[in-house]
Amino acid sequence: FGISGKHFITVTTFTSAGNIGEDGTLSCTFEPDIKLNGIVIQWLKEGIKGLVHEFKEGKDDLSQQHEMFRGRTAVFADQVVVGNASLRLKNVQLTDAGTYTCYIHTSKGKGNANLEYKTGAFSMPEINVDYNASSESLRCEAPRWFPQPTVAWASQVDQGANFSEVSNTSFELNSENVTMKVVSVLYNVTINNTYSCMIENDIAKATGDIKVTDSEVKRRSQLELLNSG
């Protein structure tokens, strides 16, 4: 990695999380340089010999790429000149977790920054009214989580109430034997109330809300990654 730049440039990374079996992004930005051919981007992973990815002279150079990343990485080439060195990662695996370094070298100088990449599985929950039950109940389902999350219920009317005694949560291993389907049933629900099902592990937190009235059922779900930024 040659050193021709006289000073350091600012390189910024963001701690992020990858959802296994999907595309992931390792985020990295730097001070832009209009001379594309003078920009070198190197991604490294702690504990791995060879590079995760290299982009230089306006194109990818995978001559030193480690085999575990072959065919799985790409930079956003059209965004490099505006200072985007982020890396797209195909088919995220648990083993992709770790500390990555984004090295940048431009005509203005050089710099680097580390990022912590977490991997796991997280998905939106869906809450439905379970009419099969003897008394009215709610069923909260989320198809893919890893590591095993905690599940908690809350209610707008009974704020602060502990629903662990009137709920039942199960974890069913999915076909790839890593992720699990989360199912939680809340019993003895009352109408004209809003219930929330919260699923959380060390990577993500998801919440599903359901409002049950005489005339309608309203649902809302949200997912947030933890410790990002």
């Epitope: 999907e22 990485t73 790409a74």
Partner: antibody, heavy 121, light 107 residues
Framework: EVQLVQSGAEVKKPGASVKVSCKAS????????IGWVRQAPGQGLEWIGD????????NYNEKFKGRVTITRDTSTSTAYLELSSLRSEDTAVYYC??????????????WGQGTLVTVSS | DIQMTQSPSSLSASVGDRVTITCKAS??????VAWYQQKPGKAPKLLIY???TLQPGVPSRFSGSGSGRDYTLTISSLQPEDFATYYC?????????FGQGTKVEIK
């Protein structure tokens, strides 16, 4: 515009070898994987393998290992598929295709016109 | 290696019909499933990739969905030009694999 132009039809005898070429234009040849797929008459599509022209890295369908070689010539932006020890069941249309996503191996988004290889004694 | 089992192998439908084709992966989970349309004597054409992303220029009547091991191609309202053979492809694994194909014929 991305274009993949393949070599012409071939007739070969059992036991022989065939080499099909695929000339790419309209994009940076060394930056995208190129895959090979075949289709026997009246049959479905069968993935053979692929190559990253920027480094020469290859992946092969286990079924063809030992009989197939995928190479490239970066000076002419051409990829090649060579299949040896030909048998009658290798009679098929052979397609080359560019994989989307640059160095990321994506789905095949641009295809050559196909090359018919006939194996007959 | 991941195999893709596609069904049905053929179907008859009329213009305006809603058509659904499914592919089941032999193992694992990933979203790397693409769908192709092929007409006789022509090269395949990419319709959908990454389970549900429509390739530019492909009509919106084509849609893809799925998760886990089960993936679906839906044509919401079959048009005369849609009569063709459709293939799924899994491209998440190191070794790619096509489904066996589904021929959509005129009823």
């Amino acid at each position: 515009e991305v274009q993949l132009v393949q070599s012409g039809a071939e007739v070969k005898k059992p036991g022989a070898s065939v080499k099909v070429s695929c000339k790419a234009s309209g994009y940076t040849f060394t930056s995208y994987w190129i895959g090979w797929v075949r289709q026997a008459p009246g049959q479905g599509l069968e993935w053979i393998g692929d190559i990253y022209p920027g480094g020469g890295y290859t992946n092969y369908n286990e079924k063809f290992k030992g009989r197939v070689t995928i190479t490239r010539d970066t000076s002419t932006s051409t990829a090649y598929l060579e299949l040896s020890s030909l048998r009658s069941e290798d009679t098929a249309v052979y397609y080359c295709a560019r994989l989307a996503g640059s160095s990321y191996r994506g789905a095949m988004d641009s295809w050559g016109q196909g090359t018919l290889v006939t194996v007959s004694s | 290696d991941i195999q893709m089992t596609q069904s049905p192998s053929s179907l008859s439908a009329s213009v305006g019909d809603r058509v659904t084709i499914t592919c089941k992966a032999s193992q694992g989970f990933n979203k790397y499933v693409a769908w192709y349309q092929q007409k006789p004597g022509k090269a395949p054409k990419l319709l959908i990739y990454y389970t549900s992303t429509l390739q530019p220029g492909v009509p919106s009547r084509f849609s893809g969905s799925g998760s886990g091991r089960d993936y679906t191609l839906t044509i919401s309202s079959l048009q005369p030009e849609d009569f063709a053979t459709y293939y799924c492809l899994q491209y998440g694994d190191l070794l790619y694999a096509f489904g066996q194909g589904t021929k959509v014929e005129i009823k």
